[in-house]
């Protein structure tokens, strides 16, 4: 009896220009001869229903139909047929087949790839044409995949230490889309220094797909307007 | 930085058993196999078998088949040697190394080494 | 098993002097038009280090005074100009098959 699992769930997350491996491991009932089997990788694009081979293993040769893709000889003697492919891509997203060929015996799995790529964060204080005592914080999120995003602003203060979300005063833009299929967008924070506590601390969270925890970019409202350092203007606080 | 820190010296009778640890950092352990060998007092090496921590699959050399097994502990990252039914020839320094899979067979980083006396 | 044959099996070499290991397998390391040869040293009191794998690869870090060839079943480790530091025993290990095995070693002193 011969047997292939994939992925447990049926789905395998990986980060933009990371080595992914793709899990396929074979099941037999005797130890495997790697000389008198096969191994063939296909891949189905999220756009064409057309499936085309990306790798395939047969005795004493291998080609790879997609650069750099590999499975392991080494780790096919114990069972192990799981596809290498270094610094993937986000149009490399779709649904991988991995067939496997002891003859007579044909045994295949299938498992859906999701290329993701995590957001940087950064906060900066624009101050051009506001108001007396008014500042504009602006969070950019940028480079990330898929995108879905949500940002929310929170705020600290010594009376209130848990964090409060703000809904007022923020204006999230559009999400622009970047040459490299990644994505952008700005939320900005409008405040009213004045009838503002010092102290209290301000937070951009942006929560996506590709981040176990919530990003968050922090500043403190001190007692002097404007008093941002420069690093706080311009830096990652995440 | 990669490294592979081994469990300490271990002292034996003949009969029981030994199992040796590797701790491994500084890569994505399932990304490469980890190999056993061992050396015994002013000899060569010896390659004992290895294991993929991915699918716990293990090849073993059929010289210890029956006495050796290796596992691994991925929420940890350390993989295991343990040989048992110890004779006085197995007195060695057991290794492990970082065993290169996809691109060519290689042992590229080594841990320090477990020395193991097996003495009545 | 595959039966890798280094000879000599020890050297002595006056520093900045050249090299030369020779290991001979019992049949051939080549599969899919690469060698499955490897080369290691280890130095007094240390465990092994890689050197060279697939014949001719030289490792991340090593000196390129250390070069390997050959394919199918004659392999050899140069060192160019050999340093105090190099002394030690050289292993050739082929991972072609299993088991994985080692050469004897050749034990490289400085005269």
């Known amino acids: 009896d011969l047997k292939v699992e994939m992925m447990a769930g049926g789905t395998q997350i990986t980060p933009l220009n990371d080595n992914v491996t793709i899990f396929c491991n074979i099941f037999y009932s005797q130890p495997l001869n790697i000389t008198s089997m096969g191994i063939t990788w296909f891949w189905k694009s999220l756009t064409f229903d057309k499936e085309v081979k990306v790798f395939e293993f047969f005795g004493d040769h291998q080609e790879a139909f997609r650069p750099g893709a590999i499975v392991s000889p080494w780790r096919l003697k114990s069972g192990d047929a799981s596809l290498r492919l270094p610094g993937i891509q986000l149009e490399e997203a779709g649904e991988y087949r991995c067939e496997v060929v002891v003859t007579p015996l044909k045994a295949q799995g299938t498992v859906q790839l999701e290329v993701v790529a995590s957001p940087a964060s950064r906060l900066l204080l624009d101050q051009v044409g506001m108001k007396e005592n008014e500042d504009k914080y602006m969070c950019e999120s940028s480079g990330f995949y898929p995108e879905a995003i949500n940002i929310t602003w929170e705020k600290q203060t010594q009376k209130f230490p848990h964090p409060i979300e703000i809904s007022e005063d923020v204006i999230t833009g559009p999400t622009i889309k970047n040459m490299d299929g990644t994505f952008n967008v700005t939320s900005c924070l409008k405040l009213n220094s004045s009838q503002e506590d010092p102290g209290t601390v301000y937070q951009c969270v942006v929560r996506h797909a590709s981040l176990h925890t919530p990003l968050r970019s922090n500043f403190t409202l001190t007692a002097a307007r404007h008093s941002l350092s420069e690093t706080e203007k311009t830096d990652n606080f995440s | 930085e990669v490294q592979l820190v081994q469990s300490g010296a271990e002292v034996k009778k003949p009969g029981a058993s030994v199992k040796v640890s590797c701790k491994a950092s500084?890569?994505?352990?399932?990304?490469?196999?980890m190999d056993w060998v061992r050396q015994a007092p002013g000899q060569g090496l010896e390659w004992m078998g290895d294991?993929?921590?991915?699918?716990?699959?293990?090849l073993y050399n059929q010289k210890f088949r029956g006495r050796v097994t290796m596992t691994v502990d991925t929420s940890i990252s350390t993989a295991y040697m343990e040989l048992s039914r110890l004779r006085s020839d197995d007195t060695a320094v057991y290794y492990c190394?970082?065993?290169?899979?996809?691109?060519?067979?290689?042992?590229?980083?080594w841990g320090q080494g477990t020395t193991v006396t097996v003495s009545s | 098993d595959i039966v890798l044959t280094q000879t000599p099996l020890s050297l002595s070499v006056t520093p900045g002097q050249p090299a030369s290991i020779s290991c001979k397998a019992s049949q051939s390391v080549d599969y899919d038009g690469d060698s499955y040869m490897n080369w290691y040293l280890q130095k007094p009191g240390q465990p092994p280090q890689l050197l060279i794998y697939?014949?001719?690869t030289l490792h991340s870090g090593i000196p390129d005074r250390f070069s390997g060839s050959g394919s199918g079943t004659d392999f050899t480790l140069k060192i160019s100009r050999v340093e105090a530091e190099d002394v030690g025993v050289y292993y050739c290990?082929?991972?072609?098959?299993?088991?994985?095995?080692f050469g004897q070693g050749t034990k490289l002193e400085i005269k």
């Open positions: 290990q082929q991972s072609k098959e299993d088991p994985r095995t």
């Open positions: 190394a970082r065993s290169e899979v996809f691109y060519g067979n290689y042992a590229d980083y």
């Open positions: 697939a014949a001719s």
């Open positions: 294991i993929n921590p991915n699918n716990g699959g293990t």
């Open positions: 500084g890569y994505t352990f399932t990304d490469y196999n």
